[in-house]
Structures are given as C-alpha cells and as structure tokens.
Interface confidence: low
C-alpha cells in the first residue's frame, strides 16, 4: 500500500510543473514541500496520512484549479468526504469567511475548479482541505503566482546552415503559444525556455529564456538525432508550465566525410590541403626555378684547370709544388691566417671537369639564389652545406661618423635589405631565364661569422689602407645595378708571371658605372652581401675611375698550416699617391673587384679567389670575394 501511495504521489508531482519544471525530487520537495509529505514524512511536523494539496494552477491568469491527493480513502481509515474551502483577502486582513469549492468536477477527480467568476488575479487566496469538519491541509497563494501556461504547440524546425566542415548545423525552432493564452491583448506575456539533447543522452541542455516564439539552435552535430522541447511561463511571475511534445530533429550527413569525433576532420582537411599546396608549390618551384634547382643540387663550381699546374698536384694536396709555381714575385710576405680557423670553404667537384656544358660558369654563378634567409651566424651554403665561402675580415679602423649609415650598425638592420639596392644585382647572361633581372635580390646580413666571433676581425693586408668600409652608403639609383658583371677579365699574363686583368663588362645600358647617375658617388649595399651560393661579403663599394687595365703582381706564401691554407696573391693595387688615380677618365670603363687572392682551404679542392681593394683618395677601398671562372683561370697560366 505504501509503495502504491509513493508511486501515486510521485506521478502527481511529476505531472506538476508548478515547481518550475525541476525534475529532481529534492528540488520539488524544496519548492513545494507540502505536496510530497507522504514521500518524506519526516519533512512534515505532523506527518499523518491525510489529504494534501499537490498543486494549484492557472493556465491563462483567468481561471485556476487546485488538486490534492486522497490518500485517506485508500487506507483503513475513513474520515468522510474531502471538501475544499477557500477565502480571499479583500483588505490587508484576511477574512475568515470560508466558501466551499465552486466546482469539484471540471478539473477532474480530487480537484476544485475556479472559473473566471471566482478568480481574482490580484487578490490572494487561502484554501484548505477538510474532512469530517477538520482541516487536513491549508495553502495560501496569489493567482498570479500559480500561473502555469499550457505547453507551446506546433513545434517545427528549419535548417539555417551547415558548417564548412559539414560536421555541425544550425537550426531554427519555431512554435506557437498555447491557444488559451491571451497573448494579443497582453494579458499574458510568456517567456519560453527551450531544451534539447541528443536522443541517447539523459541531460537536457537548457537555453536562456526568450520572449519570442522561435529561436536558433547552433552547432548541432550532423547525422545525430535530437529531441527538442519547449515550455513557457508568465513573465516575472508564476512557474513554468509543462513541456511541449518532443520535436525530433534529424540532421542528415551533408558531407562526404564522416568521422567519429569532430577534431579528426579538420586534421584530415589540413593534411589534404597541405599536401595539395605543397605539390602545387613544388611544381611552381620546379618550373620557375630550374636554374636555381640545378645550382642547389649540383652547384657548378669552376674546375681549377690552371695552365702550368698539374691538376694532380691540387688533387693530391701537394700544395708546396703549387706554392713553388706561384712564388714568382718578390713581394711575398710571410703572413698567414693561422688563427682564422673559422674561414670556411666550398668543395670543388674536380672529378667532373665537363660539367660546364650548357652555360658558362659565370652564368651559373650569376644565377645563384639570392633569396636565401638572412642570418648573422653560420649561414648555410648552398654548395657544401657549410657556411658560405670566403669571409673577408672587416677592419675596425677608419670609421667615420659619415661612414655609418644613419648611425646604425649593419647587424642592427636586418630588414633594411628589402627594396634597396643589392650590390650583386648581377648581370645575368640569360635574362629570360631569370626572374631577377628586374630587381635586386635580397642580400645576406653583414658580419657572417661564427658564434665565437662577435666582432669583425682584421684582414692581414699590406697597408692600413686596405680597410673595408663598414659603412652603409645609400644607392642613388638601386635599379641601375641590376646588370653589372662584377667578374674581372684576365686579358693577359706577363712573362714574369704577372696577371693583367681588365674591368668587368659594362651594364646593359652601355654606361660606365660611374656615369649612371651624375650624383651617384658610390655603389654600395645596405649590408655586406652573403650570397649563399658564391659570394659571401661585399662591403660598401665606391665608383672609382681607374685605368682600364691593372697589373697584378703575385706574392706567394708558403704553406704553414695544412688545416687552413691560404695561397695569397698580393692585392692588385696602384700606389695610393700615384698621379691620376683619382681622376675621372671620361668614358673609362668601371673597374670591378679584382680577384687576386687564392684560398685553398682544408683540401686541394677548395679554390677561392679574394677580391682586393682599389686605392681611393679617401682611403676607402673596394672589396669582394667570389670565384673566377675556369675560362678566366685558363688564361692566367701560359
């Protein structure tokens, strides 16, 4: 019997939404604890099994009804008929005139219905249940408090959109207010609460109350079925009514992809697009940079075919024989870079002398990639995987305030390179094959040295005038440099062994470099050039009008260090005070850096020529480094 009573009470309580729709028994007990005394008799001070009010409800603020449990009639004790009496407060004081229920039928068994004639919305009521003249339960309320609208009707939904991934979709849920709610006249102002969940879930997701009869529901999972329900309450008073009938929402799969979890798909998407993008970029790279790819994979470095020197001597590392051959000048100096252990090299592929089949070495050199990343330390060379070729040291002397561009150091301006002149806007022999014929490529940063060297090192030279200018000199016409060939041409070799070099080719415009612009005093770059392929540093240069032919006198040094060998030929210089050196010779061709220093580093295959400085009136000198082509080397030796 007790179990039956418990189930009955729970059923009644569950059907009641007077308690704000809370589906937890604990919440119901707290909200209307008097309605469930039989469930937990300990909650009630007098816990005898007597009739109890379960709820009173007004669906539309015009009528209301009250319900109770008739427990006593199902027990052994019969207390007689149950009656409901009510009283209303017309003034501040309650009247003690109790009137019996006007309608025991209309609202069903164990209920009392108050139609509009008996309902005063603003006046509080007290009701009581009696049996055999004794009060068994008593409640007080205001009609406005017990408003519980009927459930919303006509629920439906429409698809708003589907996410780009096809995983989620947004829908719009619509409904209508209950028929008996006087919405139009404003007698009732309803707020709605929508709840939804996946069919297999137990917990409903509750949306914030709204005043409209439609609401978007976002981010529902596609290919899942959802249940949606709506309930309503009188705004600012009353309790939520019962929920509407459940609306089932099934979102069909709208993507060819199906995945268990959301986070799988984006990765798949990223991988697909990533692979596609890489493929496209690879093809673009292959087709647009064929020359540079060849340079990167098989760097074409000139074979040291020097007439008069057996290549086997170079291959076998017999440097002393090479020294003997080259040591034909009297101004040899026994200085040596024994402490420059950081000078690095590029291996020459001596075994393939016929590699140069399609284009000259100069072409290959000039088509090297100038767009490698800039770095202050250890920039990797495209040829050998080591840091780039020769790295002429920078003297710290002869710095003038005027020499330093805008007062900033080279290293501090890594971003100044973009859009400014590059000294090595090289004259590409095949302009059609190069995408760089219009603009100067980006240059490397200055002072490309190893980590243990944090400042420039002096270059052992004959005089103090062999100073690299470390300053930045702004180019007046950066674009005019784009067609300059910086390779000195070997025009003759004297019987005494002196090499006669002629200046490099003029630019395409047919002007000498100094004639390109009237006000253009110098050719320079913002930072020392560090070309990944062949050139590592090109300090600030100046246009120096000199005689077109310059005589080279070689000075040979013996090998003192097998680890780090320099076969140095002395710089081709004219005396600093030589008359006419600083004069401008109209129509004279612009001299280029002359390659007069041979470096053989760590192996007989490393053959590098350094450029040396030309004397300037103001003691500023040109300096560069790079390779001499085999064609030019062939002319050096008889």
């Amino acid at each position: 019997m007790d179990l039956w009573q418990l189930l009955l009470t729970l059923a009644l309580a569950g059907s009641s939404d007077a308690f704000s729709g809370s589906e937890a028994t604990a919440a119901i007990l707290s909200r209307a604890p008097w309605s469930l005394q039989s469930v937990n008799p300990g909650l009630k001070t007098n816990s005898s099994k007597e009739p109890k009010f379960t709820k009173c409800r007004s669906p539309e603020r015009e009528t209301f009804s009250c319900h109770w449990t008739d427990e006593v009639h199902h027990g052994t004790k019969n207390l007689g008929p149950i009656q409901l009496f009510y009283t209303r407060r017309n003034t501040q004081e309650w009247t003690q005139e109790w009137k019996e229920c006007p309608d025991y039928v209309s609202a069903g068994e164990n209920s009392c219905y108050f139609n509009s004639s008996f309902t005063s919305i603003w006046i509080p009521y007290c009701i009581k249940l009696t049996s055999n003249g004794g009060t068994v339960d008593e409640k007080c309320f205001s009609v406005d408090e017990i408003v519980q609208p009927d459930p919303p009707i006509a629920l439906n939904w429409t698809l708003l959109n589907v996410s780009l991934t096809g995983i989620h979709a947004d829908i719009q849920v619509r409904w209508e207010a209950p028929r008996n709610a006087d919405i139009q006249k404003g007698w009732m102002v309803l707020e709605y609460e929508l709840q939804y969940k996946e069919v297999n879930e137990t917990k409903w997701k509750m949306m914030d109350p709204i005043l409209t009869t439609s609401v978007p529901v976002y981010s529902l999972k596609v290919d899942k079925e959802y249940e949606v329900r709506v309930r309503s309450k009188q705004r600012n008073s009353g309790n939520y009514g019962e929920f509407s009938e459940v609306l089932y929402v099934t979102l069909p799969q709208m993507s060819q992809f199906t995945c268990e979890e959301d986070f799988y798909f984006p990765w798949l998407l990223i991988i697909i697009f990533g692979i596609f993008g890489l493929t496209v970029m690879l093809f673009v790279f292959l087709f647009s940079k064929q020359q540079r790819i060849k340079m990167l994979i098989l760097p074409p470095v000139p074979v040291p075919k020097i007439k008069g020197i057996d290549p086997d001597l170079l291959k076998e590392g017999k440097l002393e024989e090479v020294n003997t051959i080259l040591a034909i000048h009297d101004s040899y100096k026994p200085e040596f870079h024994s402490d420059d252990s950081w000078v690095e090299f590029i291996e020459l592929d001596i075994d393939e002398p016929d590699e140069k089949t399609e284009e000259s070495d100069t072409d290959r050199l000039l088509s090297s990639d100038h767009e490698k990343s800039h770095s202050n330390l250890g920039v990797k060379d495209g040829d050998s995987g080591r840091t780039s070729c020769c790295e002429p040291d920078i003297l710290e002397t002869d710095f003038n305030a005027n020499d330093i561009h805008e007062g900033t150091s080279e290293v501090a301006q890594p971003q100044r390179l973009k859009g400014e002149a590059d000294l090595l806007c090289l004259d590409q022999k095949n302009q059609n094959n190069s995408p760089y014929h219009d603009a100067c490529p980006a240059t490397q940063q200055p002072s490309v040295i190893q980590a243990e060297k944090n400042k420039p090192q002096p270059l052992p030279t004959e005089g103090a005038e062999s100073t690299h200018q470390a300053a930045h000199i702004q180019l007046s016409n950066p674009s005019s440099l784009s067609n300059i060939d910086f390779y000195a041409q070997v025009s003759d070799i004297t019987p005494a062994g002196s090499v006669v070099l002629s200046p490099g080719q003029k630019n395409k415009a047919g002007m000498s470099q100094c004639d390109m612009h009237p006000e253009m005093v110098s050719l320079c770059q913002e930072n020392f050039l560090m070309d990944n392929a062949y050139f590592c540093e090109a300090d600030a240069k100046k246009c120096i009008p000199v005689a077109p032919h310059i005589k080279v006198e070689s000075h040979i040094q013996p090998s003192l260090n097998q680890e780090d060998i320099y076969i140095t030929t002395e710089s081709l210089t004219t005396a600093a005070g030589r008359p006419g050196t600083g004069e401008h010779v109209p129509g004279s061709e612009m001299p280029v850096p002359d390659y007069t220093s041979i470096h053989i580093v760590q192996s007989p295959q490393g053959l590098i020529l350094n450029a040396t400085a030309l004397p300037l009136p103001d003691k500023e000198f040109l300096s560069s480094c790079g390779y001499v082509s085999t064609d030019q080397l062939n002319k050096i030796m008889p």
């Epitope: 704000s20 604990a26 007990l29 009173c56 017990i146």
Partner: antibody
Amino acid sequence: EVQLVESGGGLVQPGGSLRLSCAASGFNVSYSSIHWVRQAPGKGLEWVASIYSYSGYTSYADSVKGRFTISADTSKNTAYLQMNSLRAEDTAVYYCARGYMYWWSYYNGAIDYWGQGTLVTVSS
Amino acid sequence: DIQMTQSPSSLSASVGDRVTITCRASQSVSSAVAWYQQKPGKAPKLLIYSASSLYSGVPSRFSGSRSGTDFTLTISSLQPEDFATYYCQQYEGSSLITFGQGTKVEIK
C-alpha cells in the same frame, strides 16, 4: 505595517540551549513562511531554518540539522527557534524574516521583511 | 546543495559608476534568485526577486538578469546611499535557501 521583532538572544556556553522568539505584526504568520537567517560577526548571511506554518513544513540548514528546531504559534502570531547543543560557530546575529509571497511560487524563499536581529554569543 | 559563488568579493566605485555583481549557481536554479542590500548594523533589504523582478519601492537603477546559471545584479548609476554589501540568494534546492558570500561596494 509589517514588523518582526526577535528576542531571546544572549550569551550561552557551548553545549547550552537558547530559544529565540519572533513576534510578527502586520501579517498573519499562519499564511506566511518564516525564516531564520544568521550572520556571524564580519561574515555573510547564512540561512538557518524555515517554517511554513499553514502546512507545518520545516526545513533546516545542514549545519544546524538535529540541533535546532523551528516552530510557530499561530495564536500568538509568533515563530520560534529552539537552539540546542550550541557551538562557538553558532555565534551570530539571528534575524527573523518573512518569506515574500506564499506558496506555489518561485518567491517562497525570497525574504521581503527582516527583523532587527538578536545576538547570540556562544562562549565559555 | 546548491552553492552560490559571488564575485567580486569587494569593489571600489565612484558615484555615477555602473556596477555589476555576479553570482554563479552550482546547478540550475531556474529563476529562484534574490538580491539583497545590507548596510552595517542593519538588516538586509530585498532588491530583486525571481532573478529579475524589482521589489516594490526599490529604485529602478537596480536590475537583475540571468544567463544560464549566472545571475547578475546591476546598479546603473551608483548613488551615495548604494555603498553597502550585496548578497545573492537562491531558494530552490534541497537546502531551501543559500546565500552568496557577499560583495562589498566601497567608495573609490
């Protein structure tokens, strides 16, 4: 005018008992809910107990359950809080308050009228 | 039991400022939330009930709102008499009533 006047507070030793009274005027306790709320010195509000005298329903905070008893005498329009086994942590100002609106509503726990409070000090 | 976490615990504001105090319920309490104002040595006063309903006699600069389990009390333009401690309260759940820790609004 609605008024609530508490009495019965004072100093008591731990383990002792006190009975607080709340005399109501301007409204009928029979048709209202009465709550006891306390506030320890320098602390926040803490609900203690409630009674809905027309149904006899009572409810207590966990911290006082089994030690405190709330009741009402409708003939005297007065509510009571019997406090037994008092502890030092029960030291507080005890307020008697009336629940706003009555049953059936969200508002049955909202308190619209408060008494001036009575201090209960539990100390040895 | 439903817990009410109130923030901030204190705030400094000037007259005319807009002040917002938030209470977060540990579980859904529908709209069964009230807000009170208490001045030192005085009993609390009801400001808001049912989360957003203004109690009679309370100035309209006070307002309440609800967003899920977050409840907010807003004072649109702080007045000198508004410097006090404010409490939120829920009255739904197995422990019928619980209060927030309180927010003290002080003069900046």
